[in-house]
C-alpha cells in the first residue's frame, strides 16, 4: 500500500492525531489535502517544522497561502522562523524575524498564545 492509499484509509481518524503521528505521516508521501490539514488539532500542528509540513502536504503546500489567516495555519506561521517560511516560496509572512531567539516558555505561551521572543 502506497502513502496515498494509506492516507485515504486513515483520513477520517486524523482530526485528533498527535504531533508524533503527523511527523511520521510526513515521511510517507501522503500529500494531505488542505481541508484535512485545517481540521488537525492546533497543538499537534504547532511543533511541526516547515520541512515536515512541506512533506506532509506535498503539492498541497500551495494552499497554505490561502489559509494563512486561519487556524491552525496562522498559529503555525507565527511559530516558524521567517527564513524557514521563505524556503516554501509562497510569500507567507508573519514568521519570527531573523536574529530573534525563541524561548520555549510554556506558561508564557499559554497566557499569550504566541512564543516569547528576545530581540537581537
Amino acid at each position: 500500500m502506497n502513502g496515498s492509499e494509506y492516507f485515504v484509509k486513515i483520513q477520517s481518524f486524523l482530526g485528533g492525531a498527535p504531533t508524533e503521528d503527523l511527523k511520521a505521516l510526513s515521511q510517507q508521501n501522503v500529500s494531505m489535502d488542505l481541508a484535512t490539514f485545517m481540521k488537525l488539532r492546533t497543538d499537534a500542528v504547532l511543533p511541526l517544522t516547515v520541512a515536515e509540513v512541506q512533506k506532509l502536504l506535498g503539492p498541497h503546500v500551495e494552499g497554505l497561502k490561502a489559509e494563512e489567516r486561519h487556524r491552525p495555519v496562522r498559529d503555525w506561521i507565527l511559530r516558524q522562523r521567517q527564513d524557514d517560511l521563505d524556503t516554501l516560496g509562497l510569500g507567507l509572512q508573519g514568521g519570527i524575524p531573523n536574529g530573534y531567539l525563541v524561548l520555549d516558555l510554556s506558561m508564557q505561551e499559554a497566557l499569550s498564545g504566541t512564543p516569547c521572543l528576545l530581540g537581537p
Epitope: P59, K65, D83, D86, T87, G89, L90, G91, L92
Partner: antibody, heavy 114, light 107 residues
Amino acid sequence: QVQLQQPGTELVKPGASVRLSCRASGYSFSSYWMHWVKQRPGQGLEWLGNINPTTGDINYNEKFRNRATLAVDKSSTTAYLQLTSLTSEDSAVYFCVRHDGFLWGQGTTLTVSS
Amino acid sequence: DIQMTQSPASLSASVGETVTITCRASENIYSYLAWYQQKQGKSPQLLVYYAKTLAEGVSSRFSGSGSGTQFSLKINSLQPEDFGTYYCQHQFGTPRTFGGGTKLEIR
C-alpha cells in the same frame, strides 16, 4: 512600488546565447518562487520553469531543460533566464512572474535573426 | 504532466451579455487553478486564484467555480474592457501548464 522590471527587447543571432533579466522591487524577493513564461507571436502562454531564491531549487519544463538555465542574484533581487543555441523558434516575449501570479514583468521581446 | 484543455478557443459576444469559459484538467488539481486576462501587447493579469477567489481590484462581474478537473470562469454583463484573451493555469506542482486560451471578441 511593487514591480518586476524587464528590458524591452533583445536582438541576437541564431546559434548564440542570451541572458534575460528580471529585477524585482517593492517586496521580499526571497519569499516567492520566480516563474518564467514564454509567448510566441499570436500564440498562447508556455511555462518554462521556476526558481526558489531562498533554496536555489529549480523546476524546468522538460521541453526547455537542455537549453534554459534559471538563476537568481539575491543581492540585486534579480532573476535570470539564459537560453542557448537560439533558433527562430525562440523568438518570443518572455515574462517573469511572481509565484502568486499577481505580479508579471512587462516582458522582454527576444528576436533571433541573422 | 497535467494537461489543461480550455474551451471554446474563441467566442463572440455583445456588451451586456454573460459568457462562460471552461477549463478541464487531465487529472485532479483540487482547487489549484488560476484565471488570467491578457490584452493585446500587454502582460496577463490575474483575475481568479484558488479556482474561485477574486484577485484584488478585479470586478465582481467575474466569478470562478469548479474543483477537481472541471472549472469555469463566468463574466456577467460584459463590458468593452473585458474583451481579450483568457487563460487558465493549474497551480498544483510543476510544470504549471496553461490552457490554450479563449479569445473573447466583440460581436
